[in-house]
Every structure is written in C-alpha cells, then in structure tokens.
Amino acid sequence: QTSVSPSKVILPRGGSVLVTCSTSCDQPKLLGIETPLPKKELLLPGNNRKVYELSNVQEDSQPMCYSNCPDGQSTAKTFLTVYWTPERVELAPLPSWQPVGKNLTLRCQVEGGAPRANLTVVLLRGEKELKREPAVGEPAEVTTTVLVRRDHHGANFSCRTELDLRPQGLELFENTSAPYQLQTFVLPATPPQLVSPRVLEVDTQGTVVCSLDGLFPVSEAQVHLALGDQRLNPTVTYGNDSFSAKASVSVTAEDEGTQRLTCAVILGNQSQETLQTVTIYSFPAPNVILTKPEVSEGTEVTVKCEAHPRAKVTLNGVPAQPLGPRAQLLLKATPEDNGRSFSCSATLEVAGQLIHKNQTRELRVLYGPRLDERDCPGNWTWPENSQQTPMCQAWGNPLPELKCLKDGTFPLPIGESVTVTRDLEGTYLCRARSTQGEVTRKVTVNVLSPRYE
C-alpha cells in the first residue's frame, strides 16, 4: 500500500512543498514520485519512506507517489492547489462627468487569480456593495448599471476581488481597483440668457450679463463670454443653482460693424451657447459752427450744423432742408441774441434704433454800453435827511463799469442807502464804460430843505 502526505495542499503560486511518499512493505523494489515539477529528494534513514521538496509550483498539480512491493504495485496522489490574487482589477474607464438621469454602466475586469472557485468580484459605491459575482472567464467581467443621481456627485466607485481561502485555513485576500470618482451634473436644455445692448458706440463701455438657472454643481460651471475675437473677463456671481456673469465691454473704431456676442456655459462634458449680434457704431456729436462765437451788435452771423453723413439734423428745432446731415441759419446779431443757444440735434438709425446726439453753442453779442432814463433817471429830488438809494443801471455786454461823479471827483454812491444831505446836491456825470466804448449821462440831485412855519 502506497500513501502520500499531505494528501491535499494549498500553496501560493511559485511556492514549494514537502511531499512524503510511504509504502507499507519494508523492502520495496521501487518508491518514488511522478511529477513535472522540479523535485529534490531529502535523504532519510529507512527504505519505506521518501521525502521530496517540490518547488516553483505554478499551477494546480497532482504529483503521484508509487511503490513496487512484493505483493504488487500501488500509487497515491496528492492534490496541490495553487492560489494567487488577480494581476489586474480594473474598472473600465468612463468620463468623470456624467449627467444626472443617465444610466451609467460600470464594468470591472479581472485578470488572473486562483482558485477561481474561491474568487468573487464585488462592485462598490463607496462601501456599499452594488453587485457581487463569482469570477468567471478570463478575463472575468462583472457589470452593473447605475442611474446617475445628483447625490452621487463626488462618489467613488470601485471594484474589489475577494479570494476567500478561510475554509482552507488561510485568510481572505482582497484586491481593489483604482477608484472612479463620479462627477454628476445638470445642464438645462435651455440656453443661457444674454442681456446686452443691441448697439454700442465706439469708445464707450457697455455691460453684458449672461445668466442661467437650474445648474448643478453651479460652482463647476465655466462661462465664456466673447465679443467677436475679444474675450471678456466677467465677474461671476453664484446662486444655489444659478449664476450671473457680468462683464464690461469696451469697443474701438476697429470693432465697428456687426459683431457676434457669445455666451457659452460648459459643465461636465456638455455646453450651452447663446449668440447675439451687437452693432458697433461711430456717431460723433454734431458740430455747431458759429462764424464767430463773439460778435458785435449788428454783425451777420452764420450758424452751421454738421453731423455724421447718414444722420439727419435739426437746428434749433428746425429740420434741415432737404432732410440730411447739414443745416444752417443766418441772423443779424442783436443784444437780445446775447447768450442765445444754438442747438443742433442729430439722429442716426443704427440697427433699427434711433440714436440722438446734441451739441449746443452759445453766441455772445457785444453791445452797449447803454444808460437810459428808465434805468438811470436824469433827475432826483429828495427831502433833506431822508434815506434814499440812488439807482442807475448801465446795460451792455460786457457789463459796463459805472461811475457817477460830481465835478469829476465826488462820487454818488449808486445802490447804497444814503442819508440825503446838502453835500449830495449837484449834477453828476454818470459814465458807463466797457471794451465796447463809453456813454455818459447827466444826473441831477436836488435836495429839498425842510420848511419851517
């Protein structure tokens, strides 16, 4: 009778094992082991027992002990089971961003590992088991479908293999794949709302606002604002599930014409875009030209108004004849025209909008000086000791200097409240003088003495 010890062995791949072959007869003609494995016999006293070291065990094997005894030949097998953990445990790659509501298929591939009967594949979300299946096939593949929810955002999905050798007196060997972190997002089907001026004047600034509601996670949304080739630098304000991106846009003469304003929102692997056209125009204020801004009374003055070639102008409310970018009027300057405003209003149509520009110029008419009876009476008769205010107003532009002197040296206090005395009596020569010339007027002050009865 041939026996083998141990009859069953579980050992790690590439490991070694000592196998003892024994026979029941004392003098066997033959005692040995049959195996493809590298073997080394260990010398022992006696003839009925032999010990072999089998090495580099790579796969399951059944070495066989045999013996030839006088009563016949017999054999005994030992069962070597090789165990090893998988060489590859991998989740099939997936885009990290997944839209909420999508069915996401997780696929785990396992290469190698034995014994397969003891090898299980587990799919997990965090620590929660989603699916558990034995490893079948090479490579073994386990799949599960997950409906992506908002609360899955940031969750880690992984695949774990479990080689359970505890029934064989060994331990549970676990291998885990690299985790796949899921980023969930919601990008609504509605395009972003874009608020901007439809027309924008050269060398001015406009404000562009792009906004969108119903985003998740809003902080991860990227906003791209551009006017033509000019990237805008918005200030983004976030709400719970919304954002508002505000940018200042400056345009120059080079941008003149129709430009495309774009707002693109990128979240995950999706984007939404809104396009709008902005017309950039140049429209300088009309020019009001006076032949001279300052003229003397009686001078002929031409007032011209010139504007953008496509504009239509009105000068002091009167439209140009024919309607167009130029208007003019002629006048003879009078004192009443001093300080008169000449206003030119120009209107230009840009992208269906009417743009208005105004320019005003003031005419200065130099006239005078004037001293007349109404404003500078020639005769005053006042009671002695009464309080009086001598009034004499000179007119002209520029406003004349006025002085009233008696005998060329004694002043009359114009506009002052004076006590009337005999000294005040007399004839005063009032002289109004300006750059336009001078005029004089005689003013007589009579003082009435109190009558004593």
Epitope: L405, G408, F410
Partner: antibody
Framework: VEESGGGLVKPGGTLTLTCTVS????????MGWVRQAPGKGLEYIGI?????RTYYASWAKGRFTISKTSTTVDLKITSPTTEDTATYFC??????????????WGPGTLVTVSS | AYDMTQTPASVEVAVGGTVTIKCQAS??????LSWYQKKPGQRPKFLIY???KLASGVPSRFEGSGSGTEFTLTISGAQSDDAATYYC????????????FGGGTEVVVK
C-alpha cells in the same frame, strides 16, 4: 502834474503857486491842493472841480483861492503866516475818478513863510 | 464833517511780519476810502482805492478792507522798503474836506 512858484515869502505878503498839467484836460478832471507842514500830516486846502466850482477846507476859506486855465491850476495864498510853511502838492482826481487805478500827484513845492 | 481817525500813530514790524493799520470815519463813507504811502521828501504814493482795490503797480502784500466807517490796511510779509507813513483819506463827501486825511501811521520795519 508839476508845481512851481514855491520859495521864501514874508508874512502878510501874497504868493501864487502854479500847477501845470499835460496829457489830460482840466475840463474833465478835478484838481486839488494838499499841503504837509514839517513834521505834520497831509491836509487838503481845496479842490477845483471839472465845472470850475471850488471847495475849500473851512480853515482855508478867504486866505486861499484856487483858479484854473486850460492847462494850469493856481493856488493864491493871501497874508501867509509862519503856520503856512509847508510843502504844497497839486493832485489830480483828489477824491474819486473815472480812471480808478490812478491819482496823479506832483513832486511838491516848498513854501517858507519867514520875515 | 467827515473826520478820519487813524490808529496807531506808530507801529514797529519785523521784516516778513504783518502790520495792521485802522482808519475810522466819523460817519459812513461807504466804500470810498483811499490809502497812501508817504516817504520823507517824496510825493505820496497811491496804494488802494474803493477801500480794497489795489492801485496800478502796487504789490499784493498790501491789502485793504472795510466799508461804512471801519477800514483796515494790512501789510503781510513786510519789507524794509515799506518803512513810511501811511495815510487814509475819505474820498466821498464834497461838503467838508477838513480832516479828509487821517493823522497818519508811521511804520518802522526792523
């Protein structure tokens, strides 16, 4: 504006000082006479207006007479006393004037009253 | 009568200092007041008219103010050349030219 006629005069005599003007018309300017006795302040004697009307300090009435021609203004001193020893100035536009920034003064002429 | 009273009679000021001279009229002369500078052996120099207006060529360190009966002449940043006697003169009434000038203020610059 330039004064002349000053010098030594005996008390009780008569002295006429003359102010000669050029560059302006006396018909449109008043002229005045001011004096300053040694160690004393300025004091007005009198003024002749552009209309030839005269105005005198109360102490000068009767002893001083102002008159004018087209280019001169005279100050006649009758019966001077030693108190009248002073420098006599002729001034254009003594009070106010149409030409604000100017008051023309002569260099003055010294009158010494002594026996 | 329009009597003009000037104070102080004499004042001392250091170079660069400020001096203030007051002039009071016995009754209102409105703004009709002139200021003169008088140095020995020289004709009076016209400084200010209408109480506050600088005569032609007068430096801005001279400043006049006031109206009615109270007037002031201020010399800021006094210079040695400002040593002189200063007179105010009423330039209003023809009725009395007695005491048209103030008594004068002697300014000594040290």
């Amino acid at each position: 504006v330039e004064e002349s006629g000053g010098g030594l005069v005996k008390p009780g005599g008569t002295l006429t000082l003359t102010c000669t003007v050029s560059g302006f018309s006396l018909s449109s300017h008043a002229m005045g006479w001011v004096r300053q006795a040694p160690g004393k302040g300025l004091e007005y004697i009198g003024i002749i207006g552009s209309s030839d009307r005269t105005y005198y300090a109360s102490w000068a009435k009767g002893r001083f007479t102002i008159s004018k021609t087209s280019t001169t203004v005279d100050l006649k001193i009758t019966s001077p006393t030693t108190e009248d020893t002073a420098t006599y100035f002729c001034v254009r536009d003594p009070y106010d004037s149409y030409d604000d920034g100017y008051r023309l003064w002569g260099p003055g002429t010294l009158v010494t009253v002594s026996s | 009568a329009y009597d003009m009273t000037q104070t102080p009679a004499s004042v001392e000021v250091a170079v660069g200092g400020t001096v203030t001279i007051k002039c009071q009229a016995s009754q209102s002369i409105y703004r009709y007041l002139s200021w003169y500078q008088k140095k020995p052996g020289q004709r009076p120099k016209f400084l200010i008219y209408d109480a506050s207006k600088l005569a032609s060529g007068v430096p801005s360190r001279f400043e006049g103010s006031g109206s009615g009966t109270e007037f002031t002449l201020t010399i800021s940043g006094a210079q040695s050349d400002d040593a002189a006697t200063y007179y105010c003169q009423q330039a209003y009434s023809s009725g009395s030219i007695d005491n048209a000038f103030g008594g004068g203020t002697e300014v000594v610059v040290k």
